[in-house]
Interface confidence: medium
Amino acid sequence: GSERTCCPVNWVEHERSCYWFSRSGKAWADADNYCRLEDAHLVVVTSWEEQKFVQHHIGPVNTWMGLHDQNGPWKWVDGTDYETGFKNWRPEQPDDWYGHGLGGGEDCAHFTDDGRWNDDVCQRPYRWVCETELDKASQEPPLL
């Protein structure tokens, strides 16, 4: 079978998931694609405990997560229900602000410097976090 018991090399294991923290920036769509190319997805935050774990690793840096409303309603990239799920927005957010002068509103969610969430222009080159469930994650280091 394809079940895995450990995280890929240089990913961090936490509560049956594996996480990879970027050190460079990408637009949301590119970050989303990059996680998918790891057979993973942008991080989906489902609890306060997971929020604290991610926040601890990213520090006070704007960082994309797997939440967007580019097609209307807010959606998590893995299908987790947004309405009934965990949320940690900053006060007054999300506000779909149009005043940035970059065209359009704000359709992608990111962790802000204090860990709370904000919606922002999806083209901004923020860091990102990939997540994959542990029973899907590769257990062996790459062979070279």
Epitope: S2, W20, Y34, R36, C130, Q139, L143
Partner: antibody
Framework: QVQLQQSGAELARPGASVKLSCKAS????????INWVKQRTGQGLEWIGE????????FYNEKFKGKATLTADKSSTTAYMELRSLTSEDSAVYFC???????????????WGQGTTLTVSS | DIQMTQSPASLSVSVGETVTITCRIS??????LAWYQQKQGKSPHLLVY???NLADGVPSRFSGSGSGTQFSLKINSLQSEDFGSYYC?????????FGSGTKLEIK
């Protein structure tokens, strides 16, 4: 040792379809993506797409969407690429390659098949 | 899509010389670049990954350098078995484009 063994040369008619195979051995098949690369005679390398056998997730170069379909069979550790509506432009050598990975998202194609020559002619 | 400009297209050199092949990228790809060697009628062979790391079994006369948008592959003291074609390839999102190649020929 890691090996990618590709199927033999193919001769096909214009408009037909072909299915090329890439049999993987020597490593855990579901842990790595399999990529396909096209090379026309005397030309450079062109990335077609990638499949993750673990999840069957696929990624395609826009240029090859509708032309190539990637699949993988976990039980036989074999990846496949079907090419449809063949024309002379599809005549090329097609390589499969394993995408290795090091420290997070640094990728590279670390092992390659020997290539399959496809000739499209009437 | 990310554009790759590889130069020179061809190079005629003698055994023992040193050559440098460059790859210029249209946007910042950090260190997400690999180099391959391909001999006539054979599959490509990984030389360098993550811009600077030598793959297993690759002789130390090969070295990769660069980051961001400008990368180089240097071959010191060329040997007869080094002749062939060389390609760079980025891994900064799809499509994983290759450079157009550099053909290294014996003078």
């Amino acid at each position: 040792q890691v090996q990618l063994q590709q199927s033999g040369a193919e001769l096909a008619r214009p408009g037909a379809s072909v299915k090329l195979s890439c049999k993987a051995s020597g490593y855990t098949f579901t842990n790595y993506g399999i990529n396909w690369v096209k090379q026309r005679t005397g030309q450079g390398l062109e990335w077609i797409g990638e499949i993750f056998p673990r999840s069957d997730n696929t990624f395609y170069n826009e240029k090859f969407k509708g032309k190539a379909t990637l699949t993988a069979d976990k039980s036989s550790t074999t990846a496949y690429m079907e090419l449809r509506s063949l024309t002379s432009e599809d005549s090329a050598v097609y390589f499969c390659a394993r995408k290795g990975r090091d420290y997070g998202t640094s990728h590279y194609f670390d092992y390659w098949g020997q290539g399959t020559t496809l000739t499209v002619s009437s | 899509d990310i554009q790759m400009t590889q130069s020179p297209a061809s190079l005629s050199v003698s055994v023992g010389e040193t050559v440098t092949i460059t790859c210029r990228i249209s946007e910042n790809i950090y260190s997400n670049l690999a180099w391959y060697q391909q001999k006539q009628g054979k599959s490509p062979h990984l030389l360098v990954y993550a811009a600077i790391n030598l793959a297993d079994g690759v002789p130390s006369r090969f070295s990769g350098s660069g980051s961001g948008t400008q990368f180089s592959l240097k071959i010191n003291s060329l040997q007869s078995e080094d002749f062939g074609s060389y390609y760079c390839q980025h891994f900064w999102g799809t499509p994983f484009t290759f450079g157009s190649g550099t053909k290294l020929e014996i003078k």
